[in-house]
């Protein structure tokens, strides 16, 4: 079958890295600089992406494969691809429309982004509070008081964190 | 709270220069870059170029022969210069914070270039 | 330079009635694709971002998707302050470049 259809179309032939061009007997010719072509058989190559600006080239465009961009230290990526970049905060903090805010008592962040997020409540599971939480990390619960008998466990790991969701710019 | 505040002259003559300024307030001009942004009055956006944090500049290479952006990091002001203008570059000219997407802009200033 | 074609460039369309704007990119521009809504005498605003996603505080009405080259936005119910006109933009390779607009009105 591969035989035949490169008999049919001799653009199948052309390699990632080139393209079938038309222009000259559909023989395969490189990419020009700043474009691409991922797979074989392709009739264009694609343009780079560019990362300029708030964005940095964390991969460079080759041939055969796409530029990949990040943020620039001191931001961190939003959406797939990296399409936008946020500002970081400090632990203990969340990006506001007025900049980076210190958590509300009785909420938390661990990482640069995202919301602060409340307290885990350990009555809710029959626990106590065995650390207390602070603006950058979640209590930690422990069992209940009825539960402290010798040989009974005594810390139980907080459930994980939910994903935070996008803050606001 | 991110702000960015266009001003100018409203009215420039043909030939003359076209020079505005983009105030901003609630972040780092060392840390964000600036995009000019224009629409003449009833059509679509145009982008002309971008002053990034470090100090390097972007042009569309319809304009790059007679524009210039820099920064004046004392004052907290980008500024747009466009040079030989005619009536083609009426427009309201916004300038917008660099984040990837365009996520804050200026109101915009109208500019109308008449003798 | 990329062209982005948006069609269409006008509509009009009922309180509720669901509102798809198309807009075509002349290159591939895998999903670096942002949609505004610009209100007369005010700038555009920042809805979509990234093809799909919502920014912050803008309500869940408002969708797109879409990569490669072809790329929808959508009211799934228009309401009466939805009247504008909404713009897309590629973010994927300079100069940036926005499509023509589509003017939005009710019926």
């Known amino acids: 079958f591969e035989r035949t259809r490169s008999l049919q179309d001799p653009c199948s032939n052309c390699p990632a890295g080139t393209f079938c061009d038309n222009n000259r007997n559909q023989i395969c010719s490189p990419c020009p600089p700043n474009s691409f072509s991922s797979a074989g058989g392709q009739r264009t190559c694609d343009i780079c992406r560019q990362c300029k600006g708030v964005f940095r080239t964390r991969k460079e465009c080759s041939s055969t494969s796409n530029a990949e961009c990040d943020c620039t230290p001191g931001f961190h990526c939003l959406g797939a691809g990296c399409s936008m970049c946020e500002q970081d905060c400090k632990q203990g903090q969340e990006l506001t429309k007025k900049g980076c805010k210190d958590c509300c008592f009785g909420t938390f962040n661990d990482q640069k982004r995202g919301i602060c997020r409340p307290w885990t409540n350990c009555s809710l599971d029959g626990k106590s509070v065995l650390v207390n939480g602070t603006k950058e990390r979640d209590v930690v619960c422990g069992p209940s008081p009825a539960d402290l008998s010798p040989g009974a466990s005594s810390v139980t790991p907080p459930a994980p964190a939910r994903e935070p969701g996008h803050s606001p710019q | 709270q991110v702000q960015l505040q266009e001003s100018g002259p409203g009215l420039v003559k043909p030939s003359e220069t076209l020079s505005l300024t983009c105030t901003v307030s609630?972040?780092?001009?060392?840390?964000?870059?600036v995009h000019w942004i224009r629409q003449p009055p009833g059509k679509g956006l145009e982008w002309i170029g971008a002053?990034?944090?470090?100090?390097?500049?972007d042009y569309n290479a319809a304009f790059i022969s007679r524009v210039t952006i820099s920064v004046d990091t004392s004052k907290n002001q980008f500024s747009l210069k466009l040079s030989s203008v005619t009536a083609a570059d009426t427009a309201v000219y916004y300038c917008?914070?660099?984040?990837?997407?365009?996520?804050?802009w200026g109101q915009g200033t109208l500019v109308t270039v008449s003798s | 330079d990329i062209q982005m074609t948006q069609s269409p460039s006008s509509l009009s369309a009922s309180v509720g009635d669901r509102v798809t704007i198309t807009c075509k990119a002349s290159e591939n521009v895998g999903t670096y694709v942002s949609w505004y809504q610009q209100k007369p005498g005010k700038a555009p605003k920042l809805l979509i971002y990234?093809?799909?996603n919502r920014y912050t505080g803008v309500p869940s009405r408002f969708s797109g998707s879409g990569s490669g080259t072809d790329f929808t936005f959508t009211i799934s119910s228009l309401q009466p302050e939805d009247i504008a006109t909404y713009y897309c933009?590629?973010?994927?390779?300079?100069?940036?470049?926005f499509g023509g607009g589509t003017k939005v009105e009710i019926k």
């Open positions: 609630g972040f780092s001009l060392t840390t964000y870059g």
């Open positions: 002053i990034w944090s470090g100090g390097s500049t």
């Open positions: 990234g093809a799909s």
């Open positions: 933009g590629q973010t994927y390779s300079y100069p940036l470049t």
């Open positions: 917008a914070r660099d984040d990837g997407s365009f996520a804050n």
